[in-house]
Structure formats: structure tokens, C-alpha cells
């Protein structure tokens, strides 16, 4: 069963973490649905974003972080390892000095921290995908 | 209730047709949701475009047409009478020449006929919002 | 094995200008940001300026602000100051060094060069 | 006045444990980085990401972070180690800022 968009959850991250999305974009890549990833700093969607990652299904990714209201230098990628109509996994992995993206199992994408991900306290993910699974699995200690 | 969103609606168009929206965008304006409004010359998503109207709410407003499968001049505009957190009522209208967009009873953008508006046969309204209404009226013959 | 070495300073009146340059060579010099920091005399370190790999982004502290122009050539592998407008207190040993990201800091310094500005 | 604060001086007996601290309200959210720097020298970076040590440094460096307190420790502390010690950290990602420095003495 579908899960609402957007989607908010409370999430507590550290090294070890990893956050599970499985979804499907709503339309066809020539119309450049949007995925949207934001680990944020508070349960409030307007609170600052530790990592924002936005797919534009077909055409790019783009990562960055938003302090103190203020979005600082994007990183941006090509690989594109998404299908068009097809449904995605993706996992976000917390390791030491960054994010790890992987996409259907394969690694694509990294972030180096900017902002300890300690400070995350929500997790949203939005835009142009229907959404069948949200999992945050904490490294057990 | 709510409509849909992704919405689809087969349509016909021509002078004195007026598409009527109402919705409010499902994230704060500093997070940059998006309105699309996709008027198609078929049924299919993939179809060709002879209106395309995005709202990117807070920043922008940009107008295009998809001929043959491709882009062409983009019309961009700053002006943004939409509100943050919100309700809009979004109307276009085909006027002889070109689409009149109003917002709020507004006029506030326009979009001169690139392609004829009778090609138009569905309207897809979609991105970030929910929606409320959807409308197409004809002109009494 | 990896070198950054500032040049440029020397003495200079006040309201006048001095352009550093910082030369770099053993690792890709376009994959990282780099950053000026000065140390005026008996005191401590203070960032000054900041660059992205591409040059397409620059930072600059408030007491520069305006003044000091941050620029980069990548097929140089080389780093610029451009500090105009100068003051007394801009006086200090200009310091280069590189940073791949917020969580690693600047894990290379050039030996930097001393500026000096007399009224 | 700088966002970080640190102390001015700290002394230790040689072979002894050494502390340095540094405090400043955006330690809980940015990552604190330590450098030595010795007289007419270049700074060193010694802990990188709030305890990381880069290569080359000696063991008995470590760092450590803790709401809005990044601690620099020296375990054993020897002769070689008297210098200036600075932390770094952020006023956002994009703009460092440096304590004002602790003058480490080592009897």
C-alpha cells in the first residue's frame, strides 16, 4: 500500500545509519518527474537541511545543503541509474565523512558532511513519486 | 474532496475556453514546490504540449510549448501573485490570440498561441499540490 | 608529492593594492576548494577567503568584504588574491591551503607570504 | 572576538596528559578540526571531523566533540609538542572560523 507524499518522519541519524526509500516516479522521464530527499534539522519543514537530494528523473542530480536559511554550493551528477517507469530502491548510508547513495543496489552517488548528521531530526521525502516503503535501520550498539 | 494529482482530463479547447484550477501547494515556499499545468495534443503523457505552464511558488513562473518532442523558447516570469500556504484559484483562458492566466480573479500571465488550441485534447495538472477543482468550460455556441 | 607555495607580498602603502598567488602542484587542484588565511603578527589565524573547485562560488569574510577578490585558474593550478584598497590591519602572513570538504578541513598549508601595509 | 572560544594558554608535565578545549554554539551542528602550529611555521592540521587524525600524526593526539565542546587531547604529552594549537570549525559550511589559539607549554 501506498504511503502518503510528502512523507515526514522523525529520524535520528549516525554513522552506521541508513535510510530506505522504495518508490516509483508518476511520470514519464520525457516529463522530468522529481524525487526529493531532505534530512533536516528540525520537525519543521522550513528548519535547515543537512542533505537535499533531488532527482530530476532522466536529467540530473543535484545535492546540497541548506544553513541557516541559505542554500550553499550545490554538487550536481549525470549518472542517471534510475528507469523510466520503473520502481527504485534507494538507500542513503551514513558512513564516517559522508552519505552514500545507492540506487537499485548500485553505488551512485556521494555527499561528504557538511553538517554532522547527528543534527538530523526528520526525514521528508516528496515531489513526483508514489511511495511504498520509508525505513530508517540504526546501527546497533 | 480532493482530486487526483497527478490529474488528467481529456479536453477540447478553442476561443473562449476557460480552464479553471483550485488547489495550495503541499510545502512552504522556501522549500520551492512546483504547479504544472500540461495542455496535450493526446491522451498520452508523452504527448506533444501546447501549453505548458510551471509554477515554481516563491521563485518563478516559466511558459513553454513541446513541439515534436522538443523544447522551444521558454518565457519566463517573476511575477508571483501566488501567496505562501495559501489556497489558488488559477483560470485560463483561450483569447484569440493567446492564453490569459489569472490568479486570484488576477490577471497575471500571458502566452501567445504557438500551436492552435483545438490540437489540445487532455489537460494534466500536477507536481506539488493538492487539488481541489478542475474545470473546463465551453463557450456557448 | 604535494606543494602549495604563496608568492606576492611585500610592502605597500596604504589604499594601495597586491595580488598573491598561490602555485600548487601533486594532487587535482580542480576537485578542491581553497582558502586564504592570514595570521596578523603575534596573533591568531583568521579565514579570509574561500573558493569552489570551479571558481563559480567565493566566500569572503567581513573585514575583506568588497575589498579582497578571491579567483582561481584551474589549467594553472593556480590560486589568486586580489586585494585592493588595503589597510593597515590587513597586515599579516597570507597563508594558502586546500579543503575537500566541511568535515576534513584544511589538510594542506602553503609556508605563506608576508604582507605589509605601512601608513 | 571569535566565534570559538579556547583558552590562551594550558601547561602539562611532560609525559602527562594535555587538554585543550573549544567552545562555541555551532560545535553541536559543525565539526571541529585542530591545528598545530609551531613558531615561524605553517599550521599542521592534527584531528580532522571532530577525532579523526591524519596520517602521520602521532597516536597520542585524539579529538573529541560534545554538544558545543570540541576537546583536543594529548596523551604523554612530549617536549616536540609545545606549540600553538587552534581549532576550526563553521559559522555555516562555507565560512571557517578559528578559535584564538592556546599556547601549549610543556614542563
Known amino acids: 500500500s501506498l504511503l502518503p507524499v510528502p512523507y515526514t518522519e522523525a529520524a535520528s541519524l549516525s554513522t552506521g545509519s541508513t535510510v530506505t526509500i522504495k518508490g516509483r516516479p508518476l511520470a514519464c522521464f520525457l516529463n522530468e518527474p522529481y524525487l526529493q530527499v531532505d534530512f533536516h534539522t528540525e520537525m519543521k519543514e522550513e528548519s535547515d537541511i543537512v542533505f537535499h537530494f533531488q532527482v530530476c528523473f532522466g536529467r540530473r542530480v543535484v545535492m546540497n545543503s541548506r544553513e541557516y536559511g541559505a542554500w550553499k554550493q550545490q554538487v550536481e551528477s549525470k549518472n542517471m541509474p534510475f528507469q523510466d517507469g520503473q520502481e527504485f530502491e534507494l538507500s542513503i548510508s551514513v558512513l564516517p565523512d559522508k552519505y552514500q547513495v545507492m540506487v537499485n543496489g548500485q553505488s551512485s552517488y556521494t555527499f561528504d558532511h557538511r553538517i554532522k548528521p547527528e543534527a538530523v531530526k526528520m526525514v521528508q521525502v516528496w515531489r513526483d513519486i508514489s511511495l511504498t516503503k520509508f525505513n530508517v535501520s540504526y546501527l546497533k550498539r | 474532496s480532493l482530486l487526483p494529482v497527478p490529474y488528467t482530463e481529456a479536453a477540447s479547447l478553442s476561443t473562449g475556453s476557460t480552464v479553471t484550477i483550485k488547489g495550495r501547494p503541499l510545502a512552504c515556499f522556501l522549500n520551492e514546490p512546483y504547479l504544472q499545468v500540461d495542455f496535450h495534443t493526446e491522451m498520452k503523457e508523452e504527448s506533444d504540449i501546447v501549453f505548458h505552464f510551471q509554477v515554481c511558488f516563491g521563485r518563478r513562473v516559466v511558459m513553454n510549448s513541446r513541439e515534436y518532442g522538443a523544447w522551444k523558447q521558454q518565457v519566463e516570469s517573476k511575477n508571483m501573485p501566488f501567496q505562501d500556504g495559501q489556497e489558488f484559484e488559477l483560470s485560463i483562458s483561450v483569447l484569440p490570440d493567446k492564453y490569459q492566466v489569472m490568479v486570484n480573479g488576477q490577471s497575471s500571465y500571458t502566452f501567445d498561441h504557438r500551436i492552435k488550441p483545438e490540437a489540445v485534447k487532455m489537460v494534466q495538472v500536477w507536481r506539488d499540490i493538492s487539488l481541489t477543482k478542475f474545470n473546463v468550460s465551453y463557450l456557448k455556441r | 608529492q604535494l606543494q602549495v607555495v604563496e608568492s606576492g607580498g611585500g610592502l605597500v602603502q596604504t589604499g594601495g593594492s597586491l595580488t598573491l598567488s598561490c602555485t600548487t602542484s601533486?594532487?587535482?587542484?580542480?576537485?578542491?576548494?581553497m582558502i586564504w588565511v592570514r595570521q596578523a603578527p603575534g596573533k591568531g589565524l583568521e579565514w579570509v577567503s574561500s573558493i569552489y573547485n570551479d571558481g563559480g562560488n567565493t566566500y569572503y569574510a567581513d573585514s575583506v568584504k568588497g575589498r579582497f577578490t578571491i579567483s582561481r585558474d584551474n589549467s594553472e593550478n593556480t590560486l589568486y588574491l586580489q586585494m585592493n584598497s588595503l589597510k593597515s590591519e590587513d597586515t599579516a602572513v597570507y597563508y594558502c591551503?586546500?579543503?575537500?570538504?566541511?568535515?576534513?578541513?584544511?589538510?594542506?598549508w602553503g609556508k605563506g607570504t608576508l604582507v605589509t601595509v605601512s601608513s | 572576538s571569535s566565534a570559538l572560544t579556547q583558552p590562551s594558554a594550558v601547561s602539562v608535565s611532560l609525559g602527562q596528559t594535555a587538554r585543550i578545549t573549544c567552545q562555541g554554539a555551532n560545535l553541536g551542528r559543525y565539526y571541529g578540526i585542530w591545528y598545530q602550529q609551531k613558531p615561524g611555521q605553517a599550521p599542521v592540521q592534527v584531528i580532522y571531523?571532530?577525532?579523526n587524525r591524519p596520517s602521520g600524526i602521532p597516536e597520542r593526539f585524539s579529538g573529541s566533540s560534545s554538544g558545543g565542546t570540541a576537546t583536543l587531547t594529548i596523551s604523554g604529552a612530549q617536549a616536540e609538542d609545545e606549540a600553538d594549537y587552534y581549532c576550526q570549525s563553521y559559522e555555516s559550511s562555507t565560512s571557517p572560523v578559528f578559535g584564538g589559539g592556546t599556547h601549549l607549554t610543556v614542563l
Open positions: 591551503a586546500k579543503l575537500k570538504a566541511a568535515y576534513y578541513g584544511m589538510d594542506y
Open positions: 571531523g571532530d577525532s
Open positions: 601533486g594532487f587535482t587542484f580542480s576537485r578542491y576548494w
